[in-house]
Amino acid sequence: KLTIESTPFNVAEGKEVLLLVHNLPQHLFGYSWYKGERVDGNRQIIGYVIGTQQATPGPAYSGREIIYPNASLLIQNIIQNDTGFYTLHVIKSDLVNEEATGQFRVYPELPKPSISSNNSKPVEDKDAVAFTCEPETQDATYLWWVNNQSLPVSPRLQLSNGNRTLTLFNVTRNDTASYKCETQNPVSARRSDSVILNVLYGPDAPTISPLNTSYRSGENLNLSCHAASNPPAQYSWFVNGTFQQSTQELFIPNITVNNSGSYTCQAHNSDTGLNRTTVTTITVYAEPPKPFITSNNSNPVEDEDAVALTCEPEIQNTTYLWWVNNQSLPVSPRLQLSNDNRTLTLLSVTRNDVGPYECGIQNKLSVDHSDPVILNVLYGPDDPTISPSYTYYRPGVNLSLSCHAASNPPAQYSWLIDGNIQQHTQELFISNITEKNSGLYTCQANNSASGHSRTTVKTITVSAELPKPSISSNNSKPVEDKDAVAFTCEPEAQNTTYLWWVNGQSLPVSPRLQLSNGNRTLTLFNVTRNDARAYVCGIQNSVSANRSDPVTLDVLYGPDTPIISPPDSSYLSGANLNLSCHSASNPSPQYSWRINGIPQQHTQVLFIAKITPNNNGTYACFVSNLATGRNNSIVKSITVSASGTSPGLSA
């Protein structure tokens, strides 16, 4: 069918477009292009008559169109008004007409956009900021980028005005980022320079470091205060409510028990006018106390949560030790110790990480141990397993299915048959089953603590007749002397005997043949080309028997050492040399020849007409099997004697 393809479909102003004609009929009288969706003489652009090779402009011709002998139309220096449909009218040699319509769209090249903002210094949790992408352009799509990534999904981010305006409600310090806007149409895309949003925030509640609150008598006390703030905060220190100094750090050398007390840091932001304070209680000991373990998560979820165990109290210049299962810490990428060894972090906990865990503080003479702590790791449910594994049952027997999924806390179980809920138990029992009990049996395991659910579906067929079995294979194209193949007879059925035949005969005795899985699986070790036979499995019980369709094993082998024929090696000058190479191989090999080491043709037969003594030499045939990845070759010496000479025999 005659069709028109526009190349490109979306055209930039000033560029060109080719209306390409496909399936143009063979014998033509002429053809003509029209602007619009139909043939209309008033809107004819240009016509072309084959016989005279004459192009005739029409009323819609602009001087920017070129018609080609293959009927394609090139329109140059495209303007907006060129957008739309174009119809080709073909008059065939038999004067029968054909028409086809194509179209394209014209878009302007976009300028580089810029971002305007209604608020250059917004205050956190108070102000909103509206960014607008300039200029406004028709038929353009507006996109926004934050730190060179697409906009995150957030209820505080709102696009409006055809995505031209990006509003950030209730700005936060995390909105301090590089913002760019982009304008796109089908022919161009331009990105603005970045605008950095400067959000005023804080001060937050200051943090006093180091975190340890327990010290030994005679040490130096060096406290530092920091509060997140923009612009940076101004700091003041108070001890037991009494002002000390307006600095970020507080230093007291050679402390005593009398330096115990409450230490307050106050942070002030002059732009937001806000103050925040933090108090830490410092205790100065003569000797360290018995340690204890605190945890940031008492019920972590497997593969989701990390757990940080901290040895308390924090005492400067103290060595902390850890034990798991009464042994020192094993080396593991999931176990991390803090710089001071006080905090042990278990990354991505597993069900095996329950413990117990102990920490200790090194004294001058001994180690003080904490009480052991055991983690309660929530996990599962894993994929439930339904037992027994049978899928076929005879009518009249009892169906008893049990479901189990590893889970902490233990899973809650539900059974569904064909999608309909049956009961909320771990076991499903149906007595005296009939064919009507065939269907999809689903066990659903649910862990209420983690909120996770997993299901397993089992197809149960109740039938007096055994189904026609089928053979599944773990390797459809094994390689000779390399691969093993395991055939499995499907399905697994209760009280059923499995049988195998090879080429219509029972299995031969061979150390390379092994039956397993109740004779359901037949494994061929180190396959050979002779194993490329028809394999059939059968199932039978006291009521019925059935056989599978044969499965033929396709063994890939070779290439064997090739044979060059004819065997002659001596020829008379002027004779034709016609050498054929053959190698046993599956799939068929690729052949190539070399004469005196020089590559020739990639054919099975090498033919040289009217040979001369110049054709003396070694003729090598190379064979290659791409499927097995193996190669082989053979070399033959050819002697060509001058016409009058009787050639001597040679091997």
């Epitope: 009288f29 043939v39 209309d40 008033n42 004819q44 016509g47 008559v49 005739t56 029409g58 008059i91």
Partner: antibody, heavy 124, light 111 residues
């Protein structure tokens, strides 16, 4: 399917006038030139006149030049032939034919479809 | 402009081939490849059979063929059939002022 239907023929006295019409359908009328030919009783075909697809260009046989006027109304898909100063030798069956010219240039195109004709008789 | 010359009649038996000639001058037939042939049965409108010397429109049997040599064009009907009995007219483009001229016509009789 292309159809051409002539009308307007009849008996007219020498020196009289007639206007023949040809209603066209089944093709894009304003893309093709249109023509009139005639055939006197028992005689051969004679080309009379052709008009281009736009109607801008007209052509006449020497025997009718100055007396016959060809025109077309592309909005009605209709071709006309105004016949004045009729003579006895103008007696003929007048055929409307698609073709003669193609598109807007002077590109020859065969008369690929013909109407059934209308008889003009000039007699006193 | 005088009419193109055609034989008054041509006859042939069914199955035979016949050829009708159309002779003009170098100003018409010889000057352009715009020769057409029309078939007209008695009381009927003409029908286009060949155009541009040798091209056949859709629906025309391939028993009809056209050719041209110098100032003479020819229409050949092979495997003559009873329904081919009719008048045949040739036509040629002349110039950009007086566009067309017809032949005097040839009566084809199937014996």
């Amino acid at each position: 399917e292309v159809q051409l239907l002539e009308s307007g023929g009849g008996l007219v006295q020498p020196g009289g006038s007639l206007r023949l019409s040809c209603a066209a359908s089944g093709f894009t009328f304003n893309t093709y030139g249109m023509s009139w030919a005639r055939q006197a009783p028992g005689k051969g075909l004679e080309w009379v006149s052709t008009i281009s697809g736009s109607g801008d260009n007209t052509y006449y046989a020497d025997s009718v030049k100055g007396r016959f006027t060809i025109s077309r109304d592309n909005s009605k898909n209709t071709l006309y032939l105004q016949i004045n100063s009729l003579r006895a030798e103008d007696t003929a069956v007048y055929y409307c034919a698609k073709g003669g010219l193609l598109w807007f240039g002077e590109l020859p195109y065969p008369f690929d479809y013909w109407g059934q004709g209308t008889l003009v008789t000039v007699s006193s | 402009q005088s009419a193109l010359t055609q034989p008054a009649s041509v006859s042939g038996s069914p199955g035979q081939s016949i050829t009708i000639s159309c002779t003009g001058t170098s100003s018409d037939v010889g000057g352009y490849n715009y020769v057409s042939w029309y078939q007209q049965h008695p009381g009927k409108a003409p029908k286009l059979m060949i155009y541009d010397v040798s091209n056949r429109p859709s629906g025309v049997s391939n028993r009809f063929s056209g050719s041209k040599s110098d100032n003479t064009a020819s229409l050949t009907i092979s495997g003559l059939q009873a329904e081919d009995e009719a008048d045949y007219y040739c036509s040629s483009y002349i110039s950009t002022s007086t566009l067309y001229v017809f032949g005097i016509g040839t009566k084809v009789t199937v014996l």
